[in-house]
């Protein structure tokens, strides 16, 4: 039995089921009350809230069968309408143990915030129960099979299902999605909508114009053979209730990226420059890697360009193995699957002055016995411009004797090329090495020069800038 929307109001206007006298007022209880039934107005041997005597198995077989009365089987209505339906049952007095009626939908009990009322109509023969269920402003989620359950004498009784069918405009369960595609390359878009009512037919729309003259049954897959420029696609879903239009999705054509929009010099050392950049628009395709181009700014434009490749992220690269105290021009470009961006504008960066690359030369060490000092002399190393301005020297002197080891160093200013160091230990070997210092740092140490310091009388020294043998005794 199927009820259409126009007949819904009749659901509760007919006569109540069973043998209900007109003068009987019903008891009402909300659905959530799962207590035993209220006592009938006519006398019973036991109140309903007390346990009835056990009916013998023979007697229970003799009890008349109890079942829910037939009711409407199928309700069809539009979204946002109100709906009411009911279950009813007549329980003879011979049944002493009865639980309340519960509502179920699609196999799950409906608890809590559902609007349901149970009404009881007692008389001399027993009680008639009507369970009313109402839904205000139905939605698609209310679609389903509703039924009642109750326990009578420990036996579960289930009503026939009432199928509620909420009809409305097509509802999208899969809409087309934005994609980025290669120029002139085929791709697919999918659209799926459902009723009820079914069937749902699909029309595809590209840039406000229909693509297919004849509708396709949902779900529909549109194969686009390829695009040369950005397009907007949507789909229309039609059923007997009307039309729903999906969101419009942009299909972008992948292009080469834009060049970086910022390039910054974060730090410079004598031989490296740390550069960061902000990528430009990615061309609808993820950036794969970036290229840092470096050329010496002071050279003519035909100077060679060094290229350093790095991953697209992080947007940071340390350019290494550069000359000290040099000016460089730097530019960055990045690539995606389509190709390389244009190169960013060239920016300027400089390395700082380096440390000296050579040690002081012609180192000589003499022992001045009368003053108990070492007299050390050297010649200034040939320092290149990029090594920076000479600020001084570091002298390392190591003293070794049978039971002692002492390592010391002194710094002297760049004025002059000699120094005097007090003798630290007698009867020992002193090893002297010297390095030049600029603002860029300390250069390499010279080869060691050894001198033997006697107890207090004879002296043996090796005034040399070449390595002295470990033992100077001849």
């Amino acid at each position: 039995e199927k009820w259409e929307e126009t007949e819904l109001d009749q659901l509760f206007s007919g006569p109540l089921p069973g043998r209900l006298p007109v003068n009987h007022r019903p008891f009402s209880a909300p659905h959530s009350s799962r207590d035993q039934l209220p006592p009938p107005q006519t006398g019973r041997s036991h109140p309903a809230h007390t346990a009835a005597p056990q009916v013998t198995s023979t007697a229970s077989k003799l009890l008349p069968p109890v079942a829910f009365n037939h009711t409407i089987g199928h309700i069809v209505l539009s979204e946002h309408k109100n709906v009411k339906f009911n279950c009813s049952i007549n329980i003879p007095n011979t049944y002493q143990e009865t639980a309340g009626i519960s509502w179920w939908k699609d196999g799950k009990e409906l608890l809590g915030a559902h609007h349901s009322i149970t009404q009881f109509y007692p008389d001399e023969e027993g009680v008639s129960i009507i369970a009313l269920f109402s839904i205000a402003s139905v939605q698609r989620s209310d679609n389903g099979s509703y039924f009642c359950k109750m326990k009578v004498n420990n036996r579960e009784i289930v009503s026939d299902p009432i199928y509620v069918e909420v009809q409305g405009l097509p509802y999208f369960i899969k809409q087309p999605e934005s994609v980025n595609v290669t120029r002139n390359t085929a791709f697919n878009l999918t659209c799926q909508a459902v009723g009820p009512p079914e069937p749902v037919n699909i029309f595809w729309v590209q840039n406000s114009s229909r693509v297919n003259e004849k509708p396709e049954r949902s779900p529909s897959v549109l194969t686009v053979p390829g695009l040369t420029e950005t397009a907007v696609f949507s789909c229309e879903a039609h059923n007997d209730k009307g039309l729903t239009v999906s969101k419009g999705v942009h299909i972008n054509i992948k292009v080469i990226p834009s060049p970086p929009t910022e390039v910054h010099i974060l730090n410079s050392t004598a031989h490296s420059i740390l550069v960061s950049w902000v990528p430009g628009f990615d061309g609808y395709s993820p950036l794969q890697n970036c290229s840092i181009q470096v050329k010496e700014a002071d050279r003519l434009s035909n100077g060679s360009v060094m290229v350093f490749n790095t991953s697209a992220s992080p947007h940071l690269y340390e350019i290494q193995q550069l000359q000290a105290l040099a000016n460089y021009s730097i530019a960055v470009s990045c690539r995606n699957e389509i190709g390389w961006s244009a190169v960013s504008p060239w920016i300027l960066a400089s390395t700082t002055e380096g440390a000296p690359s050579v040690a002081p030369l012609n180192i000589t060490v003499f022992l001045n016995e009368s003053n108990n000092i070492l007299d050390i002399r050297w010649t200034k190393p040939p320092i290149k411009r990029q090594d920076g301005e000479l600020v001084g020297y570091r002298i390392s002197h190591v003293w070794e004797s049978a039971g002692t080891y002492k390592e010391l160093s002194e710094e002297v200013s760049q004025n002059g090329s000699w120094a005097q160091i007090p003798v630290q230990i007698h009867n020992a070997t002193c090893t002297v090495r010297i390095a030049a210092i600029t603002k860029g740092g300390i250069g390499p140490f010279s080869e060691p020069v050894n001198i033997i310091i006697p107890e207090h009388s004879k002296v043996d020294y090796a005034p040399s800038s070449t390595p002295a043998p470990g033992n100077t005794d001849s």
């Epitope: 910022e262 390039v263 910054h264 010099i265 960061s276 902000v278 920016i347 300027l348």
Partner: antibody, heavy 119, light 112 residues
Framework: QSVEESGGRLVTPGTPLTLTCTVS????????MSWVRQAPGKGLEWLGI?????DPVYATWARGRFTISRTSTTVNLKITSPTTEDTATYFC????????????????WGQGTLVTVSS | AQVLTQTASSVSAAVGGTVTISCQSS????????LSWYQQKPGQPPKLLIY???KLASGVPSRFSGSGSGTQFTLTISDVQCDEAATYYC????????????FGGGTEVVVT
């Protein structure tokens, strides 16, 4: 792609005013933005730049008088204590490229918003 | 301080003629070529014409051209049209000091 300024109005001297710049068609997470102003009948004056990756840089004359800031969706210019000399049309401009606060070129201009400072 | 000087505040040209506007920078602009030119018509925002001294911005007619390097720059408009009556500004990026960008004072082009 477009840039639009808002917030310009008549203010009394000393009353702070914040101008807002909103963009469409490109992302503020990609581009530096600058503010430029033009007094009635006068030339263009550069106020400063807010970069994606580094702190704002201001013209010497503008430092302390203006504050440039950015969010993910807007660029703001606060005139901290306006004087009558700050009466001008204020332009928000996209910077096509920059390095360490130095703009390379200003490639997309808004229509400007008029600020009038008068007692 | 960084200064861009446009010596002529106004120049006139006949339709179809050629107009030249000069811009002098002190000190040299960044990388010798970070100089751009802008056109501003009455009641409108400026529009980028030339960048990096000589590169044409997108959508700008090739009748506009720029030249120069370091401190001396020129904007040339050949075959001048009526609707190119406007004020033209040079602008430069600078690395020295704190003023990293500045505009010239502008040159008005009157088309007769």
């Amino acid at each position: 792609q477009s840039v639009e300024e808002s917030g310009g109005r008549l203010v009394t001297p000393g009353t702070p005013l914040t101008l807002t710049c909103t963009v469409s068609g490109f992302s503020l997470s990609t581009y530096s933005m600058s503010w430029v102003r033009q007094a009635p009948g006068k030339g263009l004056e550069w106020l400063g730049i807010v970069s994606v990756a580094i702190d704002p840089v201001y013209a010497t004359w503008a430092r302390g008088r203006f504050t440039i800031s950015r969010t993910s969706t807007t660029v703001n210019l606060k005139i901290t204590s306006p004087t009558t000399e700050d009466t001008a049309t204020y332009f928000c401009v996209r910077v096509a490229f920059s390095t360490n606060g130095i703009p390379h070129r200003l490639d997309l201009w808004g229509q400007g918003t008029l600020v009038t400072v008068s007692s | 301080a960084q200064v861009l000087t446009q010596t002529a505040s106004s120049v006139s040209a006949a339709v179809g003629g050629t107009v030249t506007i000069s811009c002098q920078s002190s000190p040299s602009v960044y990388n010798h070529n970070w100089l751009s030119w802008y056109q501003q018509k009455p009641g409108q925002p400026p529009k980028l014409l030339i960048y990096e001294a000589s590169k044409l911005a997108s959508g700008v007619p090739s009748r506009f051209s720029g030249s120069g390097s370091g401190t001396q720059f020129t904007l040339t408009i050949s075959d001048v049209q009526c609707d190119e009556a406007a004020t033209y500004y040079c602008a430069g990026g600078f690395s020295s000091g704190s003023d990293s960008f500045a505009f010239g004072g502008g040159t008005e082009v009157v088309v007769t």
